[in-house]
């Protein structure tokens, strides 16, 4: 089948990185600068994406693959294929139409992007607040007051949370 197809259509022999040039008796010509073809048999090469302004080049365009962009420091990608860059904020803030604003009391954001989220309501799980929340961190819930031994003078704090994939020392 492949052989039959190539007899019928000489363009099918043109590999990625070339195009089938109708102006030159359907010879396979290399893609011109700033263009690419990622599959064989193409009759044109596509113009490369240009990373410009707030966009920075993550991967250069080659004759067989398009450029890839990401955002300059202080911004992060949004949209399909990083079609937009959104301003970073500090932890403890969220981005509004007027820029970065501190999280309201009772909410937190532990990232440079996204919105402020409400602190966990420990009492919904029948637990008590062990560590108060801040603008940057959620509250830490502890055992419920009923779980505490009568007459206990202190609460042993929980072991520090381990990062995923780390085994205890």
């Amino acid at each position: 089948f492949e052989r039959t197809r190539s007899l019928q259509d000489p363009c099918s022999n043109c590999p990625a990185g070339t195009f089938c040039d109708n102006n030159r008796n359907q010879i396979c010509s290399p893609c011109p600068p700033n263009s690419f073809s990622s599959a064989g048999g193409q009759r044109t090469c596509d113009i490369c994406r240009q990373c410009k302004g707030v966009f920075r080049t993550r991967k250069e365009c080659s004759s067989t693959s398009n450029a890839e962009c990401d955002c300059t420091p202080g911004f992060h990608c949004l949209g399909a294929g990083c079609s937009m860059c959104e301003q970073d904020c500090k932890q403890g803030q969220e981005l509004t139409k007027k820029g970065c604003k501190d999280c309201c009391f009772g909410t937190f954001n532990d990232q440079k992007r996204g919105i402020c989220r409400p602190w966990t309501n420990c009492s919904l799980d029948g637990k008590s607040v062990l560590v108060n929340g801040t603008k940057e961190r959620d509250v830490v819930c502890g055992p419920s007051p009923a779980d505490l031994s009568p007459g206990a003078s202190s609460v042993t704090p929980p072991a520090p949370a381990r990062e995923p994939g780390h085994s205890p020392q």
């Epitope: 700033n34 044109t44 596509d46 113009i47 490369c48 994406r49 240009q50 410009k52 302004g53 707030v54 966009f55 300059t72 420091p73 202080g74 911004f75 949004l78 949209g79 399909a80 294929g81 079609s83 937009m84 860059c85 959104e86 301003q87 981005l95 509004t96 139409k97 007027k98 820029g99």
Partner: antibody, heavy 123, light 106 residues
Framework: EVQLVESGGGLVQPGGSLRLSCAAS??????????VAWIRQAPGKGLEWLAL???????RYSTSLKSRLTISRDNSKNTLYLQLNSLRAEDTAVYYC???????????????WGQGTLVTVSS | DIQLTQSPSSLSASVGDRVTITCRAS??????LAWYQQKPGKAPKLLIY???NRATGIPSRFSGSGSGTDFTLTISSLQPEDFATYYC????????FGQGTKVEIK
């Protein structure tokens, strides 16, 4: 409030040069992520992008006009400039400066535009 | 350079009509497309960015859709202030504008 105000337009002889200015306020041309462009519109015609400069002085030019254009800026005056040489009658147009993106989300579109300055090339 | 072709070049419509303008790119451009409205003697005004996001303060009757090569601007119910010229613009590789679509009163 973001504002862009163009100046420097007027009547120019064919073969001459012009230097347009665009005074920016409400933001700094040197702030990371900021890019500003020149776009023109001939009478009764569509829009044509000419050139763009970003905060770290990366410059892009229209392929067809590259040899006649120079975009620059003066951070101390927060002002953008466009120099256009070897003027022809077909360069007669309203010249706009425009800022890329918006306050928080930036991309390859123009959110803030000046009112434009008219350049007439005629003898 | 990437070419953008708008259709129709002009159209006549009445207040309350649903209006659709299309923009076709000479190659795939993802969603790197914006729409502008321009009234005589005024600078263009951004309506839609990233193909489908309404710019700040733009009424919900304006919507954009599409990706790749084919894009659409729809005005769901034309208002008197919407009679103007509309342009699409790509930002995928440098910047180019469509030739414009003039929306006139029928």
């Amino acid at each position: 409030e973001v504002q862009l105000v163009e100046s420097g337009g007027g009547l120019v002889q064919p073969g001459g040069s012009l230097r347009l200015s665009c005074a920016a306020s409400g933001f700094s041309l040197s702030t990371s992520g900021v890019a500003v462009a020149w776009i023109r519109q001939a009478p009764g015609k569509g829009l044509e992008w000419l050139a763009l400069i970003d905060w770290d002085d990366d410059k892009r030019y229209s392929t067809s006009l590259k040899s006649r254009l120079t975009i620059s800026r003066d951070n101390s005056k927060n002002t953008l400039y466009l120099q256009l040489n070897s003027l022809r009658a077909e360069d007669t147009a309203v010249y706009y400066c425009a800022r890329e993106g918006s306050t928080t989300v930036v991309g390859d579109w123009f959110d803030y535009w000046g009112q434009g300055t008219l350049v007439t090339v005629s003898s | 350079d990437i070419q953008l072709t708008q259709s129709p070049s002009s159209l006549s419509a009445s207040v309350g009509d649903r209006v659709t303008i299309t923009c076709r790119a000479s190659q795939g451009i993802g969603t790197y497309l914006a729409w502008y409205q321009q009234k005589p003697g005024k600078a263009p005004k951004l309506l839609i960015y990233d193909a489908s996001n309404r710019a700040t303060g733009i009424p919900s009757r304006f919507s954009g859709s599409g990706s790749g090569t084919d894009f659409t601007l729809t005005i769901s119910s034309l208002q008197p202030e919407d009679f103007a010229t509309y342009y699409c613009q790509q930002g995928y590789s440098l910047w180019t504008f469509g030739q414009g679509t003039k929306v006139e009163i029928k």
